[in-house]
């Protein structure tokens, strides 16, 4: 259930290189960018996934209210710094010693700064609201069946399990994912919320992770649901620290 | 831990008829119940599923329309079945996945009876 | 996604083997399982994630496979191996109609 030994590929992460020369010959894989070996029975961490996609060439590609924390990832691409275990590390700095604090997701939380910048801690993402508008339909879509589609996707593709997902909210043609998981909850193996929500918003743009599955097909009871805009809120355990000067 | 099936019975065709799954000592919010039964002498046949956190449910296509599972409580789930005919005669198994993101059955109760006949 | 198991009857002496087969309708990411039943009783999983044997039971019983192939191997049979054995894909519960296979009776003489 690891990387797939007949042709060494990696089922959940197409942005490596695989080859059998793991224990006893088994097939590895390595991220691209990081070089580090990853588990692909399970989704890879954001932070990797971004790192490598910063080596690949460059042509590879009841509403609820967002809180006043919750923090949109409008810096888009930047090449992290990862830890050993593939996380992002809490504070990121470009070439030119610009540096700034990050969320367990990799999105800034704080001013930029220089290189004193202190980031004691990585803050954890615990609250992701995904909101998608969808392209008009003939009907609205059974709210449940929507539901209980989008729950299924999580588990199914993403291996995300169902009590992370909150809630689905629908309100035609809005559509609103809220995934919840606190320090205390995730246990070990669990994927987390901020690599799931990554593979999802990669899968709704049509540049599937995936190796080899086809790209994302979702349907309710049958009808296409098809996304024309994604937003994504994260909010974090602990509120973000921006100045004033930014929130004018 | 274990799960046991109650509700099992002979009925006549056309009839409907509910089964209760009673779950002790786990939580039932960190895993999904599926439904399967066994007709005597047959094999396995998957009925449905229930994601107790949240409640969504899933059914094999043979069983849309005519099976409905609902958590009931915070220790039960029910199987409803209407317009029952002879070949709905069968064991009826509830089991619980192992808590991960498969469907991997690793609590079975015991089993219960239904007979359909006049 | 349908599952297909052979054969449906195998008989073996004590300390033989027996091998299952199990195909998969499409790629079920060897998100797979084996179960053991015995008559009266309910079905005991054996093997998960195509080839990981649950706790407790003997190293005798083999999983294999990946993609749509699948298949359980029992060697050094004993008698209290004589059951009913079923695959059951565990990777989704949309669209199918089984998510099991045929089952297949082993007799062991």
């Known amino acids: 259930h690891t990387a797939a030994q007949d042709n060494c590929t990696c089922p959940t992460n197409k942005m490596t290189v695989c080859s059998p020369d793991g224990p006893g010959g088994r097939c590895q894989c390595r991220a691209l960018g990081s070089g580090m070996a990853v588990d692909c029975s399970t989704l890879t961490s954001k932070c990797l996934l971004l790192k490598a996609r910063m080596s690949a060439p460059k042509n590879a590609r009841t509403l609820v209210r967002p809180s006043e924390h919750a923090l949109v990832d409008n810096d888009g691409l930047y090449d992290p710094d990862c830890d050993p275990e593939g996380r992002f590390k809490a504070r990121q700095c470009n070439q030119t010693s610009v540096c700034w604090c990050v969320n367990s997701v990799g999105v800034r939380r704080t001013d930029k700064g220089d290189l004193s910048l202190r980031c004691d801690e990585l803050v954890r993402t615990h609250h992701i609201l995904i909101d998608l508008r969808h392209r008009p339909t003939a009907g609205a879509f059974n709210h449940s069946d929507l539901d209980a589609e989008l729950r299924r996707l999580f588990r199914e593709r993403y291996r995300l399990h169902p009590k992370f997902v909150a809630a689905v909210h629908y309100e035609q043609p809005t559509i609103q994912i809220e995934l919840r998981q606190n320090t205390s909850q995730k246990a070990a193996g669990d994927v987390d919320i901020g690599d799931a929500a990554y593979y999802f918003e990669r899968d709704i743009k049509g540049e599937s992770l995936f190796q080899g599955r086809g790209g994302l097909d979702l349907r309710v009871r049958g009808e296409p649901l098809q996304v024309e805009r994604t937003l994504i809120y994260y909010l974090d355990e602990i509120p973000p620290k921006f100045s004033m000067k930014r929130l004018t | 831990q274990s799960l046991e099936e109650s509700g099992g019975d002979l009925v006549q065709p056309g009839a409907s008829l509910t089964l209760t799954c009673k779950a002790s000592?786990?939580?039932?919010?960190?895993?999904?119940i599926l439904w399967v039964r066994q007709a005597p002498g047959k094999g396995l046949e998957w009925i449905g599923c229930?994601?107790?956190?949240?409640?969504?449910t899933y059914y094999a296509n043979w069983a849309k329309g005519r099976f409905a599972i609902s958590k009931t409580s915070s220790t039960t789930v029910t199987l409803q079945m209407t317009s029952l005919t002879a070949a709905d005669t069968a064991t009826y198994f509830c089991?619980?996945?192992?808590?991960?993101?498969?469907?991997?059955?690793?609590?079975w109760g015991p089993g219960t009876l239904v007979t359909v006949s006049s | 996604y349908d599952m297909t198991q052979t054969p449906a009857s195998v008989s073996e002496p004590v300390g033989g083997t027996v091998t299952i087969k199990c195909q998969a309708s499409?790629?079920?990411?060897?998100?797979l399982a084996w179960y053991q039943q015995k008559p009266g009783q309910p079905p005991k999983l054996l093997i998960y994630a195509a080839s990981d044997l649950e706790s407790g039971v003997p190293s005798r019983f083999k999983g294999s496979g990946s993609g749509t192939e699948y298949t359980l191997t029992i060697s050094d049979l004993e008698c209290a191996d004589a059951a009913t054995y079923y695959c059951q894909q565990a990777y989704t519960v949309g669209n199918i109609d089984n998510a099991f296979g045929g089952g297949t009776e082993v007799v062991v003489k």
């Open positions: 089991a619980r996945d192992d808590g991960t993101t498969s469907y991997y059955l690793n609590l």
């Open positions: 499409e790629d079920i990411y060897n998100l």
């Open positions: 000592g786990f939580d039932l919010n960190n895993y999904s």
């Open positions: 229930i994601y107790f956190s949240g409640g969504s």
